[in-house]
């Protein structure tokens, strides 16, 4: 190797200056007794190199690029060799930003997968490889005192969410949770959440059904629907409130909300609807009065109001 580049920093803030030095060893001087070292950033020649001969006979050129405005570029030093440019050495330069503080960190507890799923917004593009780590610890109090650390959760590349498995969770006990972002220019941490996984539980919705008409029960009145729901059994012991939404299948009507309904109601007569009209209905529930997240809306139930004897067809699909 005839030449070697060293740089003040290979990774800098976008727009910051960068200084580089290219040294040509003495035994390469046969190329030219007074070789002129040229600099190139990407495909563009860069003026302003200051060249000097050192006491040991090596040639050095130093250049300062006042603003590195490329997020990635190759800086090379070269010599004129006949009619062509002979590259002596090159380095990759990167420029970007330190990570912004991750924000909007939120978590939900999925009781079926037995995991706490946390998500966040990473902030603006840094233009540099940036790693995110979900960090957490167990705490007996309000997270002022740190208990056992929990194994870091590292999301897959490009994802802004991570799942903490059950074996690292303590239900009915607080956890401190935060996101750490790190790249070559710095580290940032989100504000810490302090939560009991059960307080962010997201339940599965009940399954809506038509009420089987019984011989002694009166048929629904005109503009009424009789329906029932089957709670998600594993969540049965969690006190919940639910809400129902409905809209006519035809037309552009928006959803009408009915609630709160206690999960235990299990059956309901919905009135004040248009007679002889097909309706789409859905239900969702939330842990209550204790904290929690709303479940997704249930699969739809399609029912038709009647003016006399009830008729219906049953159709489930996911929304």
């Amino acid at each position: 190797e005839c030449g070697h580049i060293s740089v003040s920093a290979p990774i800098v803030h976008l727009g910051d200056p960068i200084t580089a030095s290219c040294i040509i060893k003495q035994n390469c001087s046969h190329l030219d007794p007074e070789p002129q070292i040229l600099w190139r950033l990407g495909a563009e020649l860069q003026p302003g190199g200051r060249q000097q001969r050192l006491s040991d006979g090596t040639q050095e050129s130093i250049i300062t690029l006042p603003h590195l405005n490329h997020t990635q570029a190759f800086l090379s030093c070269a010599l004129n060799w006949g009619n062509s440019l002979q590259i002596l050495d090159q380095v990759e330069l990167r420029a970007g930003y330190p990570p912004a503080i991750p924000h909007n960190l939120s978590c939900l507890m999925n009781l079926t997968t037995s995991s706490l799923i946390c998500q966040w917004e990473p902030g603006p593009e840094t233009h540099l490889p940036t790693s995110f780590t979900l960090k957490s610890f167990k705490s007996r109090g309000n997270c002022q005192t740190q208990g056992d650390s929990i194994l870091d959760c590292v999301p897959k590349d490009g994802q802004s969410h991570c799942s903490i498995p059950r074996k690292h969770l303590l239900l009915y006990q607080n956890m401190g949770i935060w996101v750490q972002a790190e790249n070559a220019l710095g580290t940032s941490m989100s504000p810490q959440l302090c939560l009991d996984p059960m307080d962010v539980v997201k339940l599965e919705p009940p399954m809506l059904r038509t009420m089987d008409p019984s011989p002694e029960a009166a048929p629904p009145q005109a503009g009424c629907l009789q329906l029932s729901w089957e709670p998600w059994q594993p969540g049965l012991h969690i006190n919940q409130k639910c809400e129902l939404r409905h809209k006519p299948q035809r037309g552009e009507a928006s959803w009408a909300l009915v609630g709160p309904l206690p999960l235990e109601a299990l059956q309901y007569e919905l009135c004040g609807l248009l007679p002889a009209t097909a309706y789409t209905l859905q239900i969702r529930c939330i842990r209550w009065p204790l904290p929690g997240h709303w479940s997704d809306w249930s699969p739809s139930l399609e029912l038709r109001t009647t003016e006399r004897a009830p008729t219906h067809h049953h159709h489930h699909h996911h929304h």
Epitope: S114, K167, P231, Q233, P234, L236, H237, E264, A265, L266
Partner: antibody, heavy 118, light 107 residues
Framework: EVQLLESGGGLVQPGGSLRLSCAAS????????MGWVRQAPGKGLEWVSS????????PYADSVKGRFTISRDNSKNTLYLQMNSLRAEDTAVYYC???????????WGQGTLVTVSS | DIQMTQSPSSLSASVGDRVTITCRAS??????LNWYQQKPGKAPKLLIY???NLQNGVPSRFSGSGSGTDFTLTISSLQPEDFATYYC?????????FGGGTKVEIK
């Protein structure tokens, strides 16, 4: 103190009836599911019935369905089990228990013995 | 109904031994598996809930693991007060069925 106290057990003839009570204290009774679990002499635990916080949902084991009725009075912090048409195989210690949100029995009474014999 | 099968039905062990009890559900129950300890003439006591969560006041030598259909209760170093009968119970669906029990006796 958080506790459950059963009463009402005793000796009853086959076909007879008995009503068990369970007085709760030290927690907000009206917020929790409650249940009855029994244990025949020298045998394991058997779920009998449960009741939701406001009393609207009352599942039963097949072995007692139609004969036993679970109920609660939230104003008195008391759980009940009305047992009719009793059989010899209903002989057991009956435990009243509080159910946690994940279906675990996190508080138990001391148990009351029901003996069905002629 | 979901059947719970516990094994072994009994075991003999010495103080300081590591003891493992297994429980198998007849269908998947996610993590809805609880463990209880019962001593003669006493009511059962909750040890572990939701497969691996230690109930308050229970010594850390007790631990639970597993999910789906296969679960394990481990006592890392058996103490004299641990000789008792242990039961698993599923809370995924009604009825809230128990395993047949495992009696841990002194060798």
């Amino acid at each position: 103190e958080v506790q459950l106290l059963e009463s009402g057990g005793g000796l009853v003839q086959p076909g007879g009836s008995l009503r068990l009570s369970c007085a709760a204290s030290g927690f907000t009774f009206s917020l929790y599911w409650m249940g009855w679990v029994r244990q025949a002499p020298g045998k394991g635990l058997e779920w009998v019935s449960s009741i939701s916080s406001s009393g609207g949902v009352t599942p039963y084991a097949d072995s007692v369905k139609g004969r036993f009725t679970i109920s609660r009075d939230n104003s008195k912090n008391t759980l009940y089990l009305q047992m009719n048409s009793l059989r010899a195989e209903d002989t057991a210690v009956y435990y009243c228990a509080k159910l946690g949100e994940l279906g675990m029995y996190d508080l138990w009474g001391q148990g009351t013995l029901v003996t069905v014999s002629s | 109904d979901i059947q719970m099968t516990q094994s072994p039905s009994s075991l003999s062990a010495s103080v300081g031994d590591r003891v493992t009890i297994t429980c198998r559900a007849s269908q998947g129950i996610s993590s809805y598996l609880n463990w209880y300890q019962q001593k003669p003439g006493k009511a059962p006591k909750l040890l572990i809930y939701y497969a691996s969560n230690l109930q308050n006041g229970v010594p850390s030598r007790f631990s639970g693991s597993g999910s789906g259909t296969d679960f394990t209760l481990t006592i890392s170093s058996l103490q004299p007060e641990d000789f008792a009968t242990y039961y698993c119970q599923q809370s995924w669906a009604y009825g809230l069925s128990f395993g047949g029990g495992t009696k841990v006796e002194i060798k």
